[in-house]
């Protein structure tokens, strides 16, 4: 029968006794930077070309016995997971292996850099179709390794890496922390984060998604027909590399940004038990398990968005946190979040010719996060319109006044240390959907975009009594672009998007005070692109 | 050790053609920085990736590496250029004493230097 991991990544409509996805990734080449491999294993024979690249340190130990089967174990298994005949994800993908890890699974940052350079040079000498690079390794945070990954990604290569097996924040490790890399955590057959002894999968904002990574059956280097079960974030990354190969084979023109958005979009949502993660990491960690798209074609009409969290600002009074979108993405909205509730809001600002989302800490605050909503919106022209604090009793307002521009997000930022909770909440007058409304002492920022066929609407969900969480979701066919809270008073911890749902978090109800002060409204801006839908219909 | 002695001989010969001191001082106001792995047991002191500024050409990378070797030799230190990077990042990989970091950070075109460190199969 079909192994659990292959069943898990298969969309329901394709599920059968056999794993037979529609496209096996035949147009894609997957580079594997790992240990040596047993290339004559039946699973991968003829599918993996062993390059002459080798850059590894000496093995540790007072007595070391080199045995091919042990040296090849990790790489052989991963090659099998990516493209193995029987147990592989992308059975049609061809692979090339580079040896950067020794027989004990240890390598160096410098050896990995030289390996990445080798791939870039090979790409320049002999351009082929789409390239996927699988990096099933991790070390401590490395500026240079992250920089090399960024350069390779900007050269059109898709890099997929293991989040790390340290039961720790993936942002402390490289290449997991490189924003341009697709970073994969590991889950098991019960969709729980993988535990590996005392350790386990890494987590946090640097993880893009999770994938099967426990008890994964794959090629064993003990003999040419042997199979073995292995676990780890390497195995999880290999699944995503395989899925990426299949998506790229179906749509070779996909950019890295488009591929990442599709991986996120087609993932199983909210199936991971977040209690396994440390409390402060739960909100930052994506609750996504990778899956193949239900159809390898026809996703183009969708407006794809994802949520990007910044690093924590730190606790100093003037500390700020910045969240950025990828170069091919548009920042459609910006929000902020603070566990202590002490923050001074957020604003969208230009930095190096691109909009970024900046959140501001407040005096006595433990720090803030900036949360960017990053979307794929071809031919978009977006700008930010700002209204300074109104000081009038009705609050501050700003709207999109340019012809053809629609509101995709609202942000508010205030200089005063605490927006008073005693002031009455301000609700938007009906019939003015293109308008952001906020506290009279706050400056309000509207993200206004023009793109072919883009339409947006505002959806609100208000709760009169105090509640720790208020949510509002966009309906089928619409994509959440903006998420904010009304009013922006001090008991609101912040707002953020989780998939297609806008979440507004408030302080513990016991500390909130009276009912009127506890009233909170979650405001979602939901958009869709008629232009993208029409374009995809024309293709069909 | 044998090949390192050979390298050292080559270096001494090369010294005569190298002008003394810093011909090109680093651009005013930019200070190159040093980075190392936060996890001490994973550090590999003695091997460093010298990353040069983005638009640096291969010939400049090679020249900078040679200059480092020459200036180190003048101070009695043996260095070995293990690899010159180009294609992704401009720079070079050098085996040298940590005592030379201050000197290396002052070289022209240097953006930052990172001490090598271990990575592991996951």
């Amino acid at each position: 029968s079909i192994p659990w991991n292959l069943e898990r990544i298969t969309p329901p409509r394709y599920r059968a006794d056999e794993y037979q996805p529609p496209d096996g990734g035949s147009l894609v080449e997957v580079y594997l930077l790992d240990t040596s491999i047993q290339s004559d294993h039946r699973e991968i024979e003829g599918r993996v070309m062993v390059t002459d690249f080798e850059n590894v340190p000496e093995e540790d130990g007072t007595r070391f016995h080199r045995q091919a089967s042990k040296c090849d174990s990790h790489g052989t298994h991963l090659a099998g997971v990516v493209s193995g005949r029987d147990a592989g994800v992308a059975k049609g993908a061809s692979m090339r292996s580079l040896r950067v890890l020794n027989c004990q699974g240890k390598g160096t940052v410098s050896g990995t850099l030289i390996g990445l350079e080798f791939i870039r040079k090979s790409q320049l000498v002999q351009p082929v179709g789409p390239l996927v690079v699988l990096l099933p390794l991790a070390g401590g945070y490395s500026r240079v390794l992250n920089a090399a990954c960024q350069r390779l990604a900007r050269a059109g290569v898709v890099l997929v890496t293991a989040a790390g097996n340290f039961r720790d924040d993936a942002c402390l490790y490289s290449p997991a922390s490189a924003p341009e890399v697709i970073t994969v955590g590991a889950t098991n057959a019960q969709d729980q984060p993988v535990t590996l002894g005392t350790l386990g999968t890494n987590f946090g904002r640097c993880v893009d998604l999770f994938a099967p990574g426990e008890d994964i059956i794959g090629a064993s280097s003990h003999c040419s027909t042997c199979f073995v079960s292995q676990s780890g974030t390497s195995q999880a990354a290999a699944h995503v590399a395989g899925i990426a190969a299949m998506m790229l084979s179906a749509e070779p023109e996909l950019t890295l940004a488009e591929l990442r958005q599709r991986l996120i979009h087609f993932s199983a949502k909210d199936v991971i038990n977040e209690a396994w993660f440390p409390e402060d990491q739960r909100v930052l960690t994506p609750n996504l398990v990778a899956a193949l798209p239900p159809s390898t074609h026809g996703a183009g009409w969708q407006l794809f968005c994802r949520t990007v969290w910044s690093a924590h600002s730190g606790p100093t009074r003037m500390a700020t946190a910045v969240a950025r979108c990828a170069p091919d993405e548009e920042l459609l909205s910006c929000s902020s979040f603070s566990r202590s509730g002490k923050r001074r809001g957020e604003r969208m600002e230009a930095q190096g010719g691109k909009l970024v989302c900046r959140a501001h800490n407040a005096f006595g605050g433990e720090g803030v996060y900036a949360i960017a909503r990053c979307c794929l919106l071809p031919q978009a022209n977006c700008s930010v319109h700002t209204a300074p604090p109104a000081e009038a009793s009705m609050g501050t307002r700003v709207h999109c006044h340019q012809q053809g521009h629609v509101l995709t997000g609202c942000s508010s930022h205030w200089e005063v240390e605490d927006l008073g909770t005693h002031k009455p909440p301000v609700l938007r007058p009906r019939g003015q959907p293109n308008q952001c409304v906020g506290h009279r002492e706050a400056s309000i920022h509207a993200s206004c975009c023009h793109a072919p066929g883009l339409e947006c609407k505002v959806k609100e969900h208000g709760i009169p009594a105090p509640q720790e969480q208020v949510t509002v979701a966009c309906e089928e066919g619409w994509t959440l672009t903006g998420c904010s809270a009304l009013p922006g008073t001090s008991h609101v911890l912040g707002a953020y998007a989780v998939d297609n749902t806008c979440v507004v978090r408030s302080r513990d109800v016991s500390t909130t005070g009276s009912t009127s002060e506890g009233a909170v409204t979650a405001v979602a801006i939901c958009c869709r692109s008629r232009h993208l839908a029409q374009a995809s219909q024309e293709l069909q | 050790q044998e090949d390192e002695d050979g390298d050292y001989e080559e270096l001494v010969l090369a010294l005569r053609s190298e002008e003394d001191g810093l011909a090109e001082a680093p651009e005013h106001g930019t200070t190159a920085t040093f980075h190392r792995c936060a996890k001490d047991p994973w550090r590999l002191p003695g091997t460093y990736v010298v990353v040069l500024k983005e638009e640096t050409h291969l010939s400049q990378s090679e020249r900078t590496a040679r200059r480092l070797q020459a200036q180190a030799a003048r101070r009695g230190y043996l260095t070995k250029i293990l690899h010159v990077f180009h294609g992704l990042l401009p720079g070079f990989l050098v085996k040298m004493s940590g005592d030379l970091l201050e000197l290396a950070l002052k070289l022209p075109h240097v953006d930052y230097i990172e001490e090598d460190s271990s990575v592991f199969a996951q």
Partner: antibody, heavy 122, light 111 residues
Amino acid sequence: QVQLVQSGAEVKKPGSSVKVSCKASAFTFDSFGMHWVRQAPGQGLEWMGLLWSDGSGEYYADSAKGRFTISRDNSKNTLYLQMNSLRSDDTAVYYCARAMGAIYYYYAMDVWGQGTTVTVSS
Amino acid sequence: QSALTQPPSVSGSPGQSVTISCTGTSSNIGNQFVSWYQQLPGTAPKLMIYEYNKRPSGVPDRFSGSKSGNTASLTISGLQTGDEADYYCGSWDSSLSGYVFGTGTRVTVLG
């Protein structure tokens, strides 16, 4: 649950040999390195040695080199400590302990056996 | 194998904090991860802290570790009678190519 179960107590004469075993259950034994640690009566912990997960590499304490050998049978999920030329100062409780992770964390011990008392006396 | 240096004993009243130091050299604590183990009377040691300051799941957050230079420390806050035990630090030693334990510290809860 995850556990290491060790063989029973041994009483041996000086100069003789003994082989202590440690059977693992509820975890993937061949994914973890394994240590031996001993504790003489009323004394502290003394590390004896470490064997890689696949048996390919090993380290020994000076006091164990030449006389003690660590081995493992991954098909039986069992670790062994062979002690030869026993002396009275080898009298101790011997613990097997699991290395915490792969090579990057081999040196922390997160699961311990219950201990095997070895008494060497004439 | 020369051991790391710990104080033979420390004591404190219930609810108080106690700190145990562990001094080594640059070849062990200075440049390697430090672990801390608790050994209750008559039982096998138990891992309490790894990589200087990380706790395995199930270890209360009353136990915390830190490192400065060649010295590591274990702090037990909100001391409880159940914390009475021997505590050992441990670290790899790169010059010995072996693991070294501390001399051990007995923690006594007064009263």
